[in-house]
């Protein structure tokens, strides 16, 4: 059966300056390939976090993604600003040259409230 990407929250609200968690779980490790988080859709979507590399300021993984059985690809965004508002998608890719997108979560809309 095809892997499913589950984003349980349709939306979350967070006060500016606070942190928020965006949840994402997969139903399978297969097919092999990376998981990435994006804000927005289409050509203009912005990469927010990739589990293949480090160096994403303010964004960290919530669980220990180095566990070989890990299916939790939730992220935490710290020190949220109004510019962080938008809809975030957890996206599963299949390995290849290049990797190909095979499944996306339903999206979680982030609302940023003024302090």
């Amino acid at each position: 059966t095809e892997v499913k990407v589950i984003q349980p929250e349709k939306s979350v609200s967070v006060a500016a300056g606070d942190s928020t968690v965006l949840n994402c779980t997969l139903t399978s490790l297969l097919p092999v390939g990376p998981i990435r988080w994006y804000r927005g859709v289409g050509q203009s979507r912005q990469l927010i976090y990739s589990f293949t590399t480090e160096h994403f300021p303010r964004v960290t993984n919530v669980s220990d993604a180095t566990k070989r059985s890990n299916l939790d690809f939730s992220i935490r965004i710290s020190n949220v600003t109004p510019e962080d508002a938008g809809t975030y998608y957890c996206v599963k890719f299949q390995r290849g040259s290049p990797d190909t997108e095979i499944q996306s979560g339903g999206g979680t809309e982030v609302y940023v409230l003024a302090k």
């Epitope: 490790l29 297969l30 092999v32 480090e54 220990d64």
Partner: antibody
Framework: DVQLVESGGAVVRPGETLRLSCTAS????????MSWVRQAPGKGLEWVSG????????YYADSVKGRSTISRDNSKNTLYLRMSSLTAEDTAVYYC???????????WGLGTLVTVSS | ALTQPASVSANPGETVKITCSGG?????YGWYQQKSPGSAPVTLI????KRPSDIPSRFSGSASGSTATLTITGVQVEDEAVYYC???????????FGAGTTLTVL
């Protein structure tokens, strides 16, 4: 620069126990899974054991399962491998290696030699 | 187990391809160079085709299905070494290596 330095290799008798250490520097040790890989004289590489970044999950090759324990101390940037009931088949150079996101290896230590002999 | 040729040879400047098979489609592949027995391996390729920044561009990797290939374009005398393919299988959580391929530069 990423550096991995193994220690603890020795000449031991069959049936004895040994603990190997690997001290890491040049990267955020607590963010990476780690593994031990060994190479017997004249042989190829053999994966021995792996451990998740937090240390909560451990994995073993069948050849060492039940008599080896991998662990880590993230406060000391150190990886360990405790091996008991050693036999001549455990004679090898033991390397520690940093894992990539998909559990391959990107950096290796210089290795430490374990010799099991009566 | 991963299968790779025991040996390959080439003249300087030629292109060498070393294949590795047997990992299945649930595996990622890497390539490791060892210049002498007991010396530290060096990672040439990980994640099928990713080359670390300090590795010369003449080394490249690719994978198709359950077969991975290491290509050395314009082989040099200093490339004489044993090359190991390695794989990680997402269904077994186990790492495996091929037996190694000895590259001789004539």
């Amino acid at each position: 620069d990423v550096q991995l330095v193994e220690s603890g290799g020795a000449v031991v008798r069959p049936g004895e126990t040994l603990r190997l250490s690997c001290t890491a520097s040049g990267f955020t040790f607590s963010s990476y899974a780690m593994s031990w890989v060994r190479q017997a004289p004249g042989k190829g590489l053999e994966w021995v054991s792996g451990i998740s970044a937090s240390g909560s999950d451990t994995y073993y090759a069948d050849s060492v399962k039940g008599r080896s324990t991998i662990s880590r101390d993230n406060s000391k940037n150190t990886l360990y491998l405790r091996m008991s009931s050693l036999t001549a088949e455990d004679t090898a150079v033991y390397y520690c290696a940093r894992e990539t996101w998909n559990h391959l290896f990107d950096y290796w230590g210089l290795g430490t030699l374990v010799t099991v002999s009566s | 187990a991963l299968t790779q040729p025991a040996s390959v040879s080439a003249n300087p400047g030629e292109t060498v391809k070393i294949t590795c098979s047997g990992g299945g489609t649930s595996s990622y592949y890497g390539w490791y160079q060892q210049k002498s027995p007991g010396s530290a391996p060096v990672t040439l390729i990980h994640s099928d085709d990713k080359r670390p920044s300090d590795i010369p561009s003449r080394f490249s990797g690719s994978a198709s299905g359950s077969t991975a290939t290491l290509t050395i374009t314009g082989v040099q005398v200093e490339d004489e070494a044993v090359y190991y393919c390695g794989g990680y299988d997402y269904t077994t959580y186990v790492n495996t290596f091929g037996a190694g391929t000895t590259l001789t530069v004539l």
